[in-house]
């Protein structure tokens, strides 16, 4: 059950409502839990999880990453620049999360939950951002052709792509959570 949809919340009216930051924190951890579950299926199915990070790095995926210039590290920390980077990065990950939708058998619902929870997280963060104009939304046509290209790969490359997306998304979310803790 995604955060905020917990039936226990209804049964406990005395509980303090979550602050915006707590809700975002909880949402990110919920997505991280979903990623873990998906990775278990991926690792059981293929030996991708044994691949070294270096081997995986030699791919042509352009997955979002945190860099010093993004203002998310405490040195040179810039709340608005960082928030824009996090939202933009999550929007860029959406096409990859769409790709994951047909990649799981026993964890199909979990893959959908990760995708939907990410959309909710983006909405939470957009409410927090002051400068929504600075957020660039990926081009739908570009995304559509990327999706077609990824789906046309052979089985081995698709397994590697799945593993790489999940690992990179996890690292991006962890970096985001660390940065959001400073806001």
């Amino acid at each position: 059950v995604p955060p905020g949809e917990d039936s226990k919340d209804v049964a406990a009216p005395h509980r303090q409502p979550l602050t915006s930051s707590e809700r975002i924190d909880k949402q990110i951890r919920y997505i991280l839990d979903g990623i873990s579950a998906l990775r278990k299926e991926t690792c059981n199915k293929s030996n991708m999880c044994e691949s070294s990070k270096e081997a995986l790095a030699e791919n042509n995926l352009n997955l979002p990453k945190m860099a010093e210039k993004d203002g998310c590290f405490q040195s040179g920390f810039n709340e608005e620049t960082c928030l824009v980077k996090i939202i933009t990065g999550l929007l860029e990950f959406e096409v990859y999360l769409e790709y994951l939708q047909n990649r799981f058998e026993s964890s199909e619902e979990q893959a959908r939950a990760v995708q939907m929870s990410t959309k909710v997280l983006i909405q939470f963060l957009q409410k927090k951002a002051k400068n929504l104009d600075a957020i660039t939304t990926p081009d739908p046509t570009t995304n559509a052709s990327l999706l077609t290209k990824l789906q046309a790969q052979n089985q081995w490359l698709q397994d590697m792509t799945t593993h790489l997306i999940l690992r990179s998304f996890k690292e991006f979310l962890q970096s985001s959570l660390r940065a959001l803790r400073q806001m």
Epitope: I35, C49, F73, Q74, S75, G76, E171, Q182
Partner: antibody, heavy 122, light 111 residues
């Protein structure tokens, strides 16, 4: 109560591979957000972080040791292991395994093994 | 290989206060609020004192406190006791899922 116990040979020959295992009791190594590190201490010197394996099995290594280090786990035995290749006498140290209780926003070590002495000598 | 910089030794008098510094860079101490401090007695494993810059670990008395300013972290021990004589190490998260320790500081408690 979580307990960590290092095991492995106390003597390794130069150029060989050092292999150590850390057995964890009192909690699963796959518990969400936990991470498990190897840290070493050469005689009379400070602590050196070597690398970590997190709750998903993802590994990260110290840049200075990256080319020689490999950390893996055996979840069925609740153990994680360190392999350090091409050892030299400079790798002589007490090797500790330790737990980070929250790798997302923690980065500290609340439980440690008692340490195992490894000497590299021919 | 990279290490945080600590003074090799400091001394303090029983009952008084002593501060141990730990200097890093914007990639570790300055970049994150993930500084921890450990006490190591001879022949034993390190013991966690402080994490997240200033949060005391379970069971650690409030004589131990941590702080941070810029790229430097500090551990302050007040009301010094003879059993505080030990080696103290700082550690920090470092960019891209790495960690780094300080070289250690030997604390001597003078009568």
């Amino acid at each position: 109560e979580v307990q960590l116990q290092e095991s492995g040979p106390g003597l390794v020959k130069p150029s060989q591979t050092l292999s150590l295992t850390c057995t964890v009791s009192g909690g699963s190594i796959t518990t969400r957000y936990y991470a498990w590190s190897w840290i070493r201490q050469p005689p009379g010197k400070g602590l050196e972080w070597m690398g970590v394996i997190d709750y998903d099995g993802d590994t990260y290594y110290s840049p200075s040791l990256k080319s020689r280090t490999s950390i893996s786990w055996d979840t069925s035995k609740n153990q994680f292991s360190l392999q350090l290749s091409s050892v030299t006498p400079e790798d002589t140290a007490v090797y500790y395994c330790a737990r980070d209780p929250d790798v997302v926003t923690g980065f500290h070590y609340d439980y440690w093994g008692q340490g195992t002495q490894v000497t590299v000598s021919s | 290989n990279f290490m945080l910089t600590q003074p090799p030794s400091v001394s303090g008098t029983l009952g008084k206060t002593v501060t141990i510094s730990c200097a890093g860079t914007s990639s570790d101490i300055g970049g994150y609020n993930y500084v921890s401090w450990y006490q190591q007695l001879p022949g034993t494993a390190p013991k966690l004192l402080i994490h997240r810059v200033s949060t005391r670990a379970s069971g650690i008395p409030d004589r131990f406190s941590g702080s941070k300013s810029g790229n430097t972290a500090s551990l302050t021990i007040s009301g010094l006791r003879s059993e505080d004589e030990a080696n103290y190490y700082c550690a920090s998260y470092r960019n891209f899922n790495n960690a780094v320790f300080g070289g250690g500081t030997q604390l001597t408690v003078l009568g």
